[in-house]
Interface confidence: low
């Protein structure tokens, strides 16, 4: 039987709305929850497409609105239709379409022919897509002050680019408790929005934002050492697209060190953690004398999945230590803001020659004084494989 409704089902998950002039919104289409295909035609009163219109159409793959009165598609119109891959908006009254509208979609084809599109920087993204042959873009009519049926590039004098974003940082070193002033300078045509992304800063500083385009200010009040390695990002958008730049504020603080008890792995490991900004230099002592690192006793830093912290973790690796390695291990850490030390006793093996003189020690020691000629321990960082 023929369908006399405004919108008629097509197959198991399609809907076709072609009765002229009967729709002015797509909101509340009945049974739309499982739709994968929506075809709309001859709806001259359908003028706007907002994100609310497609709410609940999460399965939508194909949307066609043709020969209708569509004049505005909101930048977030497809927020609720992430699976949309085919979009046909031909023969409407669209003069422009924001790059934000299609951002995040994996469109296989986009058809905009038959719209009075105005050639401007706002459509630069579309021209780029068409030139690069991306996702089967069809525009056919892109007007540059006058009508025409061919793709018209922007004039040579027109410079269409995303904004230029720069963050000005303090020149001097920043210390715990300081207030830090950052300024984001934005340049570009038709600037729309700009802001800071500060999600990583929670707990690291009190944030005060001020100013508006083209210059945004940010004060980080009473900064803590937690601010290190955290991104402060400034972004800006215009008709052409989005740009962002990130910086990290380096907050100086004294060295600190923590040692754990030796644990037996493939090699023995005396675990340590060191912190400080700038990163402190390290030196090991064994029973009060400098421990010169060798291929069998060496410092190894563990690769951390966390790139957003200053604390470094590692091991003093000891390859098959014997009783001669039993003793007191001290790790000294120092940077320009302070020094720290931590010690731990390690007993790897009982002395099998209790009543005999001790064997020669297989590591070289030298007293910790100004005359020492021993070299500092070599930091073998992430290139040293674990174990």
């Amino acid at each position: 039987a023929s369908c006399r409704e405004v919108c008629c089902p097509v197959g198991p998950s399609g809907l076709r709305c072609t009765r002229a002039g009967s729709l002015d919104t797509l909101r509340g289409l009945r049974g739309a929850g499982n739709l994968t295909e929506l075809y709309v035609e001859n709806q001259q009163h359908l003028q706007r497409l907002e994100f609310e219109d497609l709410q609940g159409l999460g399965e939508l793959r194909s949307l066609t609105i043709v020969k209708s009165g569509l004049r505005f598609v909101a930048p977030d119109a497809f927020r609720f239709t992430p699976r949309l891959s085919h979009l046909n908006l031909s023969s409407n009254a669209l003069e422009s379409l924001s790059w934000k509208t299609v951002q995040g979609l994996s469109l296989q084809d986009l058809t905009l022919s038959g719209n009075p599109l105005h050639c401007s920087c706002a459509l630069f993204w579309l021209q780029r897509w068409e030139q690069e042959g991306l996702c089967g873009v069809h525009t056919q009519t892109l007007h540059d002050s006058g009508p025409g049926d061919q793709f018209l590039p922007l004039g040579h004098n027109t410079s269409c680019g995303v904004p230029t974003v720069k963050i000005q940082m303090p020149n001097d070193s920043v210390e715990v408790g300081d207030d830090v002033f950052l300024q984001c300078q934005v340049e570009g045509l038709a600037l729309q929005q700009a802001d800071w992304i500060l999600t990583e800063l929670e707990g690291a500083a009190t944030v005060k934002k001020f100013g508006d385009l083209p210059s945004l200010g940010l004060i980080l009040v009473n900064v803590t050492s937690d601010l290190n390695k955290k991104n402060v990002t400034c972004w800006a958008e215009n008709d052409v697209g989005r740009a962002e730049v990130s910086v990290q504020v380096s907050v100086s603080f004294p060295a600190s060190v923590h040692l754990g008890l030796a644990v037996e792995q493939h090699h023995w490991c005396i675990p340590f953690s060191v912190d400080g900004q700038p990163a402190p230099s390290l030196r090991w002592l064994f029973n009060g004398s400098v421990l010169n690192e060798t291929s069998f006793i060496f410092t190894q830093f563990l690769e951390s999945a966390l790139t957003n912290e200053t604390m470094r973790h590692g091991c003093l690796r000891l390859n098959q230590p014997t009783h001669v390695n039993n003793g007191n291990y001290t790790l000294l850490a120092a940077n320009p803001y302070g020094q720290a030390a931590a010690s731990v006793m390690a007993a790897f093996m009982d002395n099998p020659f209790e009543f005999n003189p001790e064997d020669p020690i297989p590591v070289s020691f030298s007293p910790v004084d100004g005359n020492s000629t021993s070299r500092d321990p070599v930091e073998k960082k992430d290139e040293t494989p674990f174990g």
Epitope: T25, R27, G28, D53, A74, P75, A190, Q192
Partner: antibody, heavy 117, light 106 residues
Framework: QVQLQQPGAELVKPGASVKLSCKSS????????MHWVKQRPGQGLEWIGE????????NYNEKFKNRATLTVDISSSTAYMQLSSLTSEDSAVYYC??????????WGQGTSVTVSS | QIVLTQSPAIMSASPGEKVTMTCSAS?????MHWYQQKSGTSPKRWIY???KLASGVPTRFSGSGSGTSYSLTISSMEAEDAATYYC?????????FGSGTKLEIK
Amino acid sequence: QVQLQQPGAELVKPGASVKLSCKSSGYTFTNYWMHWVKQRPGQGLEWIGEIYPSNGRTNYNEKFKNRATLTVDISSSTAYMQLSSLTSEDSAVYYCARSRYDPMEDWGQGTSVTVSS
Amino acid sequence: QIVLTQSPAIMSASPGEKVTMTCSASSSVGYMHWYQQKSGTSPKRWIYDTSKLASGVPTRFSGSGSGTSYSLTISSMEAEDAATYYCQQWSSIPLTFGSGTKLEIK
């Protein structure tokens, strides 16, 4: 801080025209629609139309389409509404209000128009 | 055009009393928006997208509804809530407002 500044009052004669202004500050003028809303004394709100400054695109309530003209001056971030062929029915407060992706977020203080001979 | 009918037109409530006013649309709208207007001042956005409170609106206010039927509720009336409340649809041109509910304090 966002501000929409409107003159306090206008007195005009029947049959004449009036051009009302709404000066914007504190935001990017071209990125927001500007709406005009009429309120007669002791009555409700009536939408007249909207304009998008970046391209001058307009939409009107059919009731006002032939008498209301919305324009903008981007250089001064000012929106205008010209209302022609005025009668006593047009005596009202006229508000401008801006919107982007949400409804009318900020309103002007309104201009009181009195049509009287 | 979509006609919005608000009821009641006028109501009064005592401090601490729960207040509910309704807005009925002549055809389905996706969201309803509410504005508060006090005498001699411009309207203020009060509730948008049916249930989101605008900045600075006390949490005793709430909004709900769908389709053609929407409501604004005040859980506990306070003197400063006395005002006229207008609903508005933003689904089709022309944008339309309800005729308003005038809320008075007893």
